[in-house]
Interface confidence: low
């Protein structure tokens, strides 16, 4: 990743330093571990999404826990705190991306194997919308490779 040189980038760096992204890391790690423990069902099926197309998504509390989280109050608390932290980045797409990249980098050593890494990455990509926030238009979540992340 290129180092930012703009004033806006320095503003983002100070935002990142102030932010506590640990609850996001804890929420995601618990989520993928729970998914692994469940009965082999597809953890990405749309029926398990915190928003349902039949609801008016703009009226829903963006911090309400996803159906997964009702099984673990701790995780629900992590998600709410995580969303509160990510909310600080919504008006700056580049900064939201930096925050997500930081989460990915912080957890990369704890992820066991390519499959778990891909799962973590998918959940991380979903995180902004689970919080009712806008996903960054471009964001490379690869930790070691220089190329852009593509499915």
């Amino acid at each position: 990743r290129q180092q930012w040189e703009l004033q806006g980038d320095r503003r983002c760096q100070s935002q990142l330093e102030r932010a506590n992204l640990r609850p996001c890391e804890q929420h995601l790690m618990q989520k993928i571990q729970r998914d692994e423990d469940s009965y082999g069902r597809d953890p990405y099926s749309p029926s398990q999404d915190p928003y349902s197309p039949s609801q008016d998504p703009d009226r829903r509390d963006p911090y309400s826990p996803s159906p997964y989280d009702r099984r673990g109050a701790g995780s629900s608390q992590h998600q709410e705190r995580c969303c509160n932290e990510l909310n600080e980045f919504e008006n700056n797409q580049r900064c939201m991306c930096e925050a997500l990249q930081q989460i990915m980098e912080n957890q990369s050593d704890r992820l066991q194997g390519r499959q778990q890494e891909q799962q973590f990455k998918r959940e991380l990509r979903n995180l902004p919308q689970q919080c009712g926030l806008r996903a960054p238009q471009r964001c490379d979540l690869e930790v070691e490779s220089g190329g852009r992340d593509r499915y």
């Epitope: 806006g8 980038d9 197309p53 998504p57 797409q93 998918r122 919308q129 960054p136 238009q137 499915y151």
Partner: antibody, heavy 117, light 107 residues
């Protein structure tokens, strides 16, 4: 290779509802993190970004269209759709669907819809 | 909404020429800018993203620069296949907005 293809009636009468569907091939529309967008281009004019829908049904609409626009998603058909109510001649345009977020924005080739009696 | 002012609206040039198109935002968009190429009847294609990064597979004669509010797109050494319409798009804020487009024609 992911491809998007728009389909809809070429002609819509004023005051009626315009409907366009975008079929996605080469990727599941349920993949999280992407948003599926609609953009239009009036004849000889610039582009207007109309809004998006996430795979989970969450939407954002351009405030200039908010009272008339609705987007929906059909995961079983791997399609997403646009409806625009109370159309006038000013809604005559090429309608493009697109996939945005996380990587290269990917557009369909567009479909021209004319509003005329 | 963020207004994107693109100029010129049309441009005549010859094969081998160097051409430059500019896009100006009415507020800071950092580097959240795409440059697209569009040919009638085809899907618009991203050439440059994040204001200056070359999209995979795009020839190096295309380049972009700028940050904040002023952005430039350059084609060095025009090729016959480059005659098309080019437009910028900001994705820093919702709703995303576009420049009016520049039609590049053969002189």
């Amino acid at each position: 290779q992911v491809q998007l293809q728009e389909a809809g009636p070429r002609l819509v009468k004023p005051s009626q509802t315009l409907s366009v569907t975008c079929t996605v091939s080469g990727a599941s529309i349920t993949i999280g993190g992407y948003y599926w967008s609609w953009i239009r281009q009036h004849p000889g004019k610039g582009l207007e970004w109309m809004g998006y829908i996430y795979s989970n049904g969450r939407t954002y609409y351009n405030p200039s269209l908010k009272s008339r626009i609705a987007m929906s998603i059909d995961t079983s058909k791997n399609q997403f759709s646009l409806k625009l109510t109370s159309v006038t001649a000013a809604d005559t345009a090429i309608y493009f669907c697109a996939r945005e977020a996380w990587e290269t924005p990917l557009w369909g080739q567009g479909t021209l819809i004319t509003v005329s009696s | 909404d963020i207004q994107m002012t693109q100029s010129p609206s049309s441009l005549s040039a010859s094969v081998g020429d160097r051409v430059t198109i500019t896009c100006q935002a009415n507020q800071d968009i950092v580097n959240s800018l795409n440059w697209f190429q569009h040919k009638p009847g085809t899907a618009p294609k991203v050439l440059i993203y994040d204001a200056s990064k070359l999209e995979t597979g795009v020839p190096s004669r295309f380049s972009g620069s700028g940050s904040g509010t002023h952005f430039t797109f350059t084609i060095s050494g025009l090729q016959p296949e480059d005659f098309a319409t080019y437009f910028c798009q900001q994705y820093e804020n919702l709703p995303h907005t576009f420049g009016q487009g520049t039609k590049l024609e053969i002189r």
